[in-house]
């Protein structure tokens, strides 16, 4: 039976330009975390692997960080990165979690300026 | 003046499907998210996903995922929602609404689409 | 999925109260960032739902100031301090801070 429930950074408004952090947390279960992937709109942007370490899509390399933890951070933001966010917990004995995070990215005009600023 | 023209009520047949459109007008379709949001007889809210034009990205709530399909149309600065397989519970009141920047609230939503499935 | 909950249901009122909503949510709405998107709507029967609050407490454009909004974390309200013939209908909250967006069950302002 799946008790745990992802947590996550919650929705986020962002400015052209800016890095965000995006971050799941797993909680309320005993279940080992084998592998965590990242994924927007269906493409893998990266992987965590308990045993292997991370990986980074070739194509995201230039403006994608592994971390914070099982945390991901993006930088040098298009507006084409507005989007759904996809944090996926692949778990043994429990299966798959799954959070998710919508990334609005705005001109540096409308965006909240909090949100240039990583999480400390 | 911000504008979203949603098309007229629509009576259809049960396992028929339907689109409904919403056609923006006073400011950048492209800027914007359009969200859609379900008013079901018991005048609950639901909010069924969004899409963002500039990208076609989407977001779906995962209990109207594989209900409805959103897509649009960036020529004619349109929004659609498809409704497959209709049962009598998607009879409701659908709206479009343009997401607020920054703020994730919706500022301008459209007069609403009246569906009712029946045989 | 985020549950909100909004009481009262029913809100009978007389022209001229001061009225409060309140709304619940079943975690924080309070982002990484420290933004929370908490937003309130009016809809009127027969009209499509208006935008009254945004951002916990931002009025939007052309609201009147007898509105306003507050709380933090879980708890939110909306004040009318002065109840007039077009403030009648149904209040919505909305939590957009986490997937998906959830409405509150909606309160009914109606004249006792």
């Known amino acids: 039976m799946m008790t745990g429930t992802i947590e996550t950074t919650g929705n986020i408004s962002a400015e052209k330009g800016g890095s965000i952090i995006l971050q799941c947390h797993l909680s309320s279960t005993t279940a080992q975390v084998t592998q965590v992937n990242w994924e927007q709109q269906d493409q893998l942007l990266a992987i965590c692997n308990a045993d292997l370490g991370w990986h980074i899509s070739p194509s995201f390399k230039d403006r994608v960080a592994p971390g914070p933890g099982l945390g991901l951070t993006l930088q040098s933001l298009t507006v084409n990165d507005t989007g759904e966010y996809f944090c996926i917990y692949h778990t043994y004995p429990d299966g798959t979690y799954t959070g998710r995070i919508f990334l609005e990215v705005l001109e540096s005009s409308v965006a909240e300026h909090g949100a240039r600023f990583q999480i400390p | 003046e911000v504008q979203l023209q949603q098309s007229g009520p629509e009576l259809v047949k049960p396992g028929a499907s339907m689109k409904i459109s919403c056609k923006a007008s006073?400011?950048?379709?492209?800027?914007?998210?359009m969200n859609w949001v379900k008013q079901s007889q018991g005048d609950n809210l639901e909010w069924i996903g969004l899409?963002?034009?500039?990208?076609?990205?989407?977001s779906y709530n995962l209990k109207f995922k594989g209900k409805a399909t959103l897509t649009v149309d960036k020529s004619s600065s349109t929004a659609y929602m498809e409704l497959l397989s209709l049962t009598s519970e998607d009879s409701a009141v659908y709206y479009c609404?343009?997401?607020?920047?920054?703020?994730?609230?919706?500022?301008?939503w459209g007069q609403g689409t009246s569906v009712t499935v029946s045989s | 999925d985020v549950v909100v909950t909004q009481t009262p249901l029913s809100l009978p009122v007389s022209f001229g109260d001061q009225v409060s909503i309140s709304c619940r949510s079943s975690?924080?709405?309070?982002?990484?960032?420290?933004?929370?998107?908490l937003s309130w709507y009016l809809h009127k029967p027969g009209q499509s739902p208006q935008l009254l609050i945004y951002g916990i407490s931002n009025r939007f454009s052309g609201v009147p100031d007898r509105f306003s909004g507050s709380g933090s974390g879980t708890d939110f309200t909306l004040k009318i301090s002065t109840i007039e013939p077009e403030d009648l209908g149904m209040y919505y909250c909305?939590?957009?801070?986490?997937?998906?967006?959830?409405f509150g069950g909606g309160t009914k302002l109606e004249i006792k």
């Open positions: 006073g400011f950048s379709f492209t800027a914007y998210t």
């Open positions: 609404a343009r997401g607020l920047q920054r703020f994730f609230a919706m500022d301008f």
């Open positions: 909305l939590q957009y801070t986490h997937q998906p967006p959830t």
């Open positions: 899409i963002v034009p500039y990208n076609g990205g989407t």
């Open positions: 975690q924080s709405l309070a982002n990484s960032y420290g933004s929370t998107y």
